[in-house]
């Protein structure tokens, strides 16, 4: 039975040209995290594998930085980066947990961080 929950940074905003950290945290389970995938809609951004370390998708390697931890740092943000981001935790023996973050990239300096929220 899957008992874990994913806590994410929730709805966040950032300024164009700036950077943002996407973070998820898996709690309430003793399952072992074997891999975390970061995806934007249906596009793979990065993978962090417990054995192999990071795989950054070639099309993002110049502006995606691994970490901190299992998180992901997006740099040189553009308005096109606005949208949904997903952290997909592969665990043993539970299976897969998914967290969602919505990022809004703003033209001006009105960017403000949203509240954290949980996805069971």
């Amino acid at each position: 039975m899957m008992t874990g929950t994913i806590e994410t940074t929730g709805n966040i905003s950032a300024e164009k040209g700036g950077s943002i950290i996407l973070q998820c945290h898996l709690s309430s389970t003793t399952a072992q995290v074997t891999q975390v995938n970061w995806e934007q809609q249906d596009q793979l951004l990065a993978i962090c594998n417990a054995d192999l370390g990071w795989h950054i998708s070639p099309s993002f390697k110049d502006r995606v930085a691994p970490g901190p931890g299992l998180g992901l740092t997006l740099q040189s943000l553009t308005v096109n980066d606005t949208g949904e981001y997903f952290c997909i935790y592969h665990t043993y023996p539970d299976g897969t947990y998914t967290g969602r973050i919505f990022l809004e990239v703003l033209e001006s300096s009105v960017a403000e961080h949203g509240a954290r929220f949980q996805i069971p």
Epitope: T34, Q35, L44, L52, G53, H55, P58, S59, K61, D62
Partner: antibody
Amino acid sequence: EVQLVQSGAEVKKPGASVKVSCKASGYTFTNYYMHWVRQAPGQGLEWIGRIDPTSGATKYNDNFKGRATLTVDKSTSTAYMELSSLRSEDTAVYYCAREGGFGYYFDYWGQGTTVTVSS
Amino acid sequence: DIQMTQSPSSLSASVGDRVTITCRTSENIFTYLAWYQQKPGKAPKLLIYNAKTFAEGVPSRFSGSGSGTDFTLTISSLQPEDFATYYCQHHYGIPLPFGQGTKLEIK
């Protein structure tokens, strides 16, 4: 066109070292991780290790830790695999292989370098 | 380490036949499995990754399926150029092991 061109065949004595090169072209070298895989005569495929050309960070198969060393020269878009303390069981074809865009599989391979270890 | 079991080790078939090769893993690897084709004296060539995604330029007669621990590579109608050795590989963790290979021969 993506190409991985490897150095020529080598004959080495037991206990010696060998360094195989893999020159990449047709893509941005630092955007893709590089792996090394070997195949003994008539046998299957065995993964040796992986290197990030940007940072030089490496990961190795436990079977090769301490004996295999992976390096890159970004200025020439070349990856290297050095294997030390050679023994007859290291006789094999050694391949460099580029990591795919969506995970830890291999989308392009070099033509292979035959390394023969014989006294 | 996750163990890979590929079967059969060899297979005789005729042009036009439908052929299936299976790969089983000792633990759940989700869909992180690739298939390669290798011809004598040549480097392996990627056919399928993520269990069912086609590599560039791979003919549609090849297809991959499966998830978890059981995977298959199917060739719907064998062509003369398909006679080769096929390997599965899980791309989910060190040591990125390959299956033992399936040699596909002409009957």
